[in-house]
């Protein structure tokens, strides 16, 4: 999906008012310095591409983030503010249902959510130069 035509300010507002605290709660008990940010993004569409990938695509050691509250809210926000997103996701969801996994919080998942927090911070500050 091409995130170029999303309403970025509306997604930012959704993140600040409904998603950010759920990411913090997920990470509760871990130090903010515990994980290095290894995933970056260069502009808002790129950030959303990376956010979607980390949130919804199972990775080795962390297969369950898509079932977390912050993931559901992210999915809902993208569907509302990115034209055509919901249509492109329907087929992907049918495939996901076939490999539904139970929610497990692993260190790998914590690291992944830490990366997500960094991507969202970057998304919210699009005028900052890339480090």
């Amino acid at each position: 999906y091409d995130f170029t035509n999303c309403d970025f300010e509306k997604i930012k507002a959704a993140y600040l008012s409904t998603i950010s605290k759920d990411l913090i709660t997920y990470m509760s008990g871990t130090k903010s310095t515990e994980f290095n940010n290894t995933v970056s993004c260069s502009n808002r569409p790129h950030c959303l591409t990376e956010i979607q990938s980390l949130t919804f695509n199972p990775t080795a050691g962390c297969a369950s983030l898509a079932k977390e509250m912050f993931a559901m809210k992210t999915k809902a926000a993208l569907a509302i503010w990115c034209p055509g997103y919901s249509e492109t996701q329907i087929n992907a969801t049918q495939a996901m249902k076939k490999r539904r996994k139970r929610k497990v919080t692993t260190n790998k998942c914590l690291e992944q959510v830490s990366q997500l927090q960094g991507l969202w911070r970057r998304f919210n500050r699009p005028l900052l130069k890339q480090q």
């Epitope: 959704a14 709660t25 079932k67 559901m72 809210k73 809902a76 569907a79 919901s86 329907i90 969801t93």
Partner: antibody, heavy 117, light 107 residues
Framework: QVQLVESGGGLVQPGGSLRLSCAAS????????MSWVRQAPGKGLEWVSG???????YYADSVKGRFTISRDNSKNTLYLQMNSLRAEDTAVYYC???????????WGQGTLVTVSS | DIELTQPPSVSVAPGQTARISCGGD??????VYWYQQKPGQAPVLVIY???KRPSGIPERFSGSNSGNTATLTISGTQAEDEADYYC??????????FGGGTKLTVL
Amino acid sequence: QVQLVESGGGLVQPGGSLRLSCAASGFTFSSYYMSWVRQAPGKGLEWVSGIFFDGTTYYADSVKGRFTISRDNSKNTLYLQMNSLRAEDTAVYYCARQQYFDHIDIWGQGTLVTVSS
Amino acid sequence: DIELTQPPSVSVAPGQTARISCGGDSLGGKYVYWYQQKPGQAPVLVIYGDSKRPSGIPERFSGSNSGNTATLTISGTQAEDEADYYCQSYTNALSTVFGGGTKLTVL
């Protein structure tokens, strides 16, 4: 303007079935997470069920296995199929748009379901 | 999973400040929303994201959430604020949960 209109409520005997419908207008229905919330006479609000644009569904424990939520995005309509109805299911049923899988920003006017013999 | 506890009733004199609490285990780690419901009407969202007001909601409505308690505050309460108020949050099982409701009486 943004509107949700429920229909299908009425009197039904215990053990019976009923199907509620909710017609949505004024917004891109196919993009939103939609829910049913009920309110028994003189009681508080109880969330019943919700459904994503892609058909992913969620249910309250009290209705799991008896109620089925569905949607037809081409008709901008939300449904609630209620089977094995009990007296405690008697309530006003509200169709609701649940913004960001989270808070309800638009409510219908409600439709009354009475389960009684 | 989380249960939300509200006082059944709160009374306030016109012009005074009304505070309605909503308690739940580690509630501060979740977002809380507040609805106003008048007799015979559907509920209306008055606070979302703990403390944000939807457009059209008067400034006298405010919200806070920390620890195990969220609070809806109505400053300079008016007669028209008399209604039932419900808090709402969500569970770890991805379901929506409401408090039992509080009847606000303006004396």
